[in-house]
Every structure is written in C-alpha cells, then in structure tokens.
Interface confidence: low
C-alpha cells in the first residue's frame, strides 16, 4: 500500500483540505470520491457539478483538493483510488464541527426573593459534537445538570441550574458558558440576578457625638433600612411605653430634646418592604447630668477683684459600666 | 426505517380511561422528545403534551393538565399517554412524533389512533 | 395563553407562488415549525428554523419570519401541494406548543 491520506476536522462553513499521496508514484490514475462515491476529481478533472469543489495541487504523487463552506452533510468518509494492479484504495475522514447555533439562557423568574430556589436554563443547540456548559455565579462555577438532545448527529445541550439566591446575589451575573471545539475564545451569556430582600435596620446616633446621653441634653437617632425594593415605611415607635410628648420625628430621624430619667427605655426602629419587615432597637440610658462642687472662694483685700476658682466634678452615677449606646438589628 | 405506530384508542364513555402506546423503531428512541398531538375531527392540530428523552420532564397543554400524563419506557422503546376523566372534547385522533431539538419541530409523526369519547 | 393566527385558505394557480403567513407573540421570540397535512395523512414536517428543510422537502419551499409573523412560501405551486399548512411554535418562555389554525391551500 503506498497511497496515504490524513483525516480531517473541519469547522462548518470553513474550508477542509483533502490530500490523496502516493508514495512511489507509476503515474497511475488518481481518483477523489464522496461518501456516496461520487466521483469529484478523475486525475484533474471534476465530474461533480459541486463548484465548493476546487483543485489545489495535481501531480502523479498528489490529488490535492479543497471544499469550501463546509456543511454538516459533507461529513463522511472521502475516497482516494490508485487505479494501480490490483487498484489501492483509501480513505479520509471528515468530521465536521458545528459551533452551538443559539446560546439562550432562561430565567425562571425576573425577579426572585432572598432565600428562594430558581431555575436557570441554558440550551445550546444544534452544534456537533454536544456543547460542554458550564456555569457561573460571578466568578464561582456551579454546576449544572445537562440532558443531551441528538437529531441527524447534532446535538442540543440544556443544563439545569437550581440556585437558592440571596440578598448578596442582587446584581451579580450568572453566566452560561459554552466549550466546544469549534469555539475558540469564551462563548458565553449571562443574566443579572434581580434578587428582593427584607430590609437591615442599623440605627446610627448622630448626637451626641461622644455617645453619652444625660439629663436635658438632646438625643438625634437616624435610622439606616437597606432592602430591595428600598422599604416603604420606616417608623419609630417605643417599646412597651408611649413616645415622649417632646419627641419628634422626621422621617428617618428621632429628636428628643430636654432628656429626662422618664425617657429611658427601648426605642425601636421598624422597616418594612413587600418582603418583609425587619427592626432595630436602641436602648435609652439617661445618665445625671454633671454635678458642680462650689471650691473655695479667695478675697484679696489689696484689690477690688474677687478670684472664683471653679472645681467642677463630672460624676457618672454608672461609673466602671459599659457606654450608654445599645442597639441590637432584628 | 425510522417508524412510529401508535394504539390503544377507542371508544370510551365520559368519565372514563384509556392508555394509548406508540412503539418507537429505526432510530435511538432515548435520545429523543417525544410528543402527542391531537385532532379533533375536521378541526385542526392541537399538541397535548411532550417529555424529554430521559422522561425527566414532562409537559402538558393546559387543557389535559392533571388528566393525562405522558410517559415513556425506552427500553422497550415506547411512548405512552394515560388518559382519565375524558371528556366528549377529547374525542379526536391521537398522533406521537418525534421532536427535533426537543419540540420545536416534529419531524416524524405516527399514523394516529382514534378516541371516542361519548355515550 | 398565546396563539397562532393563520388564514383559513388560500387559492394559487399551479406554477404561482404562494405565501402562508402566521401571527402571534411567540413568534417575536422563536422560529415556527410548518406541517403539510394532506387529507387522512399524518402532518410532514416541511420547514423549521430560521432556514431549515428537512430532507425530501422540495426547495420550492422555504419560510421567512418577521416581528411577530412567519411567512411559508410555496415557489411555483404544484398538485401536490394541495393540503392544510400548519404553523406551530413555543408559547412564549412556557413548556407548552402552539399550532395554527391551519391554512387550506388549493391549487387550481
């Protein structure tokens, strides 16, 4: 045997080279055929009314020929004959890739809320061999369960994605990507998680800056809810007592001017949104104010001027305990 | 030859049930969606249900939701449809096909086999 | 639930083109399926996709698709294309399948 070929893979709609050899040449006739043995080329001459056909190189030691716009139906084995005594025959193998036609990935739900199971799909269709899909969850790969679909050696790819999505998936892409042979590069689509979540209260002390609340200063809480969608109400609201009468409120903000003893107690931040509610409690200790030790006072007889000298005693009537800022989220 | 033939149609009062079978030959039936598709007399085709190649997932037109349900036993190469509490607008005749990149073309279908729904 | 819209029928003179269109919101989103039915025969697959001719199909026909309606054009009618025409394609982001009403085409 000394007539030799090369199989071939080719990308569909790409150019495949096929090559007939002969090693020690007797300038015997060199014929090219199809998968259903058409003849394409007897020696330079092409019988086969298919133009995708053209001649690359002839001599008595090759038949070297091109198909242009490669299809899924030229797939197949490729027939080189040596008309020698006995006649050689050979054969080439064409494998054609078929990129995935249609990457679609499929959300089960625009919108989905925190803690809840969705389904993602993702089909690649019609490419050969079967598209491998893999996903991603940001950059995290999850996996996927895939079936495999085949009519007329092509293959449709649809992997499953379960996901539980939370609050920190709001924004984040998930990503469907393909690998495949016929793909160089990433081949990919993604869809943004919409994710709704209750609101977080946090409640920030704005005044006074040092923390320390005592009797007939003021007090400013701000109350921070972050939720999606942005809650609808913030309230504040005291725990097991009436607000106090010189309270007030704006918006996010609770003023109580003039503290007093009677103010103590559990402030209570609430936010809600269509998914949820959710609070934050500050727990109110007014300390005594600061109390002032009158110091002795000395006259000096060569002046008129009387010298005050002031000793003023901050006492904390809950000194060595732990500041007086208590919030707790719920 | 690729071939589908379906059966176990007839006649059956309202109320009642009937299993129809389409023996599946001359291609790899599991790695196929199958489908069912009616036709009521001189009206036009309506699909009634599908499943995966697996038998994983099942689909169903909203009209015989919760009253039929579409099964498959690919070791014998056979798609099945279970149909309780028929109704005299399920009269009609049955086909099975075979999906093409799962059911979004059919390209082989049965002969069909007839149900009669009615007193 | 969505649906196909087709016209109940159409005459063509044998030789002439016709077209057969389909309507509906599925189709904004995917390529119809088209079945010939010819009477006490079982649908044939005859076009799908955005250019896809099942093998057997004669060239004469071939399908467009638009907005929210496909097109099946028959070049150059022929005696034997006298049948029913059903287009079908996935409703919406459902598992479920359309078809058409069916268009009647005579070819005279």
């Known amino acids: 045997q000394n007539l030799f070929t090369k199989d071939v893979t080719v990308i569909e709609g790409e150019v495949a080279t096929i090559s007939c050899q002969v090693n020690k040449s007797d300038d015997s006739v060199i014929q090219l055929l199809n998968p259903n043995r058409q003849t394409i080329y007897f020696r330079d001459f092409r019988p086969l009314k298919d133009s995708r056909f053209q001649l690359l190189n002839f001599s008595s030691s090759e038949l070297k020929v091109s198909l242009t716009n490669v299809s899924i139906s030229d797939e197949g084995r490729y027939f080189c004959q040596l008309y020698t005594d006995p006649p050689q025959e050979s054969y080439t193998t064409i494998t054609v890739l078929v990129p995935p036609r249609n990457l679609m990935i499929d959300i089960q739900k625009d919108t989905a809320v925190e803690g809840e199971e969705i389904e993602v799909n993702c089909t690649a269709m019609a490419s050969k061999p079967a598209t491998t899909i893999r996903w991603f969850k940001g950059n995290t790969e999850l996996k996927g369960k895939s079936e495999v679909e085949e009519w007329s050696d092509m293959y449709t790819v649809t992997s499953q994605l379960m996901l539980k999505v939370h609050k920190e998936d709001d924004g984040v892409p998930v990503i469907c990507q393909v690998e495949h042979p016929a793909v160089t590069g990433n081949l990919q689509t993604q869809r943004y998680l919409e994710v709704q979540y209750k609101p977080q209260v946090h409640i920030q002390m704005t005044y006074p800056l040092q923390g320390l609340t005592r009797e007939g200063d003021a007090l400013e809480l701000t109350c921070e809810a972050i939720g999606k969608p942005q809650p609808v109400m913030v309230t504040w609201v005291r725990v097991d007592d009436e607000m106090p009468q010189h309270a007030v409120l704006s918006g996010p903000n609770l003023f109580i001017n003039n503290l007093n003893k009677t103010d103590n107690g559990t402030y209570r931040c609430e936010a809600s949104n269509i998914v949820g509610k959710a609070h934050s409690d500050y727990m109110l200790y007014v300390y005594d104010p600061p109390t002032t030790i009158p110091p002795p006072t000395t006259t000096t007889t060569t002046t008129t001027t009387t010298t005050t000298t002031i000793l003023t005693i901050i006492t904390d009537s809950r000194a060595g305990e732990e500041g007086s800022i208590r919030a707790v989220d719920h | 030859e690729v071939q589908l033939v379906e059966s176990g149609g007839g006649l059956v009062q309202p109320g009642g049930s009937l299993r129809l079978s389409c023996a599946a030959s001359?291609?790899?039936?599991?790695?196929?969606?199958m489908s069912w598709v009616r036709q009521a007399p001189g009206k036009g085709l309506e699909w009634v249900s599908g499943?995966?190649?697996?038998?994983?997932?099942?689909y169903y037109a909203d009209s015989v939701k919760g009253r039929f349900t579409i099964s498959r036993d690919n070791s014998n190469n056979t798609l099945y449809l279970q149909m309780h509490s028929l109704r005299a607008e399920d009269t009609a005749l049955y086909y099975c096909?075979?999906?093409?990149?799962?059911?979004?073309?059919?390209?082989?279908w049965g002969q069909g086999t007839t149900v009669t729904v009615s007193r | 639930s969505s649906e196909l819209t087709q016209d109940p029928a159409v005459s063509v003179a044998s030789g002439q083109t016709v077209r057969i269109t389909c309507q509906g919101d599925?189709?904004?989103?995917?390529?119809p399926s088209w079945y010939q039915q010819k009477p006490r025969q079982a649908p044939v697959l005859v076009f799908f996709g955005e250019n896809n001719r099942p093998s057997g199909i004669p060239d004469r026909f071939s399908g467009s698709a638009s907005g929210n309606t496909a097109s099946l054009t028959i070049a150059g009618a022929q005696a034997e294309d006298d049948a029913d025409y059903y287009c079908?394609?996935?409703?919406?982001?459902?598992?479920?399948?359309?078809f058409g009403g069916g268009t009647k085409v005579t070819v005279l």
């Open positions: 079908s394609s996935r409703d919406g982001n459902d598992d479920r399948w359309l």
């Open positions: 599925s189709l904004r989103h995917y390529y």
């Open positions: 001359g291609f790899t039936f599991r790695s196929y969606t």
């Open positions: 499943i995966s190649g697996s038998g994983g997932s099942t």
């Open positions: 096909a075979r999906g093409l990149y799962g059911l979004y073309a059919m390209d082989v």
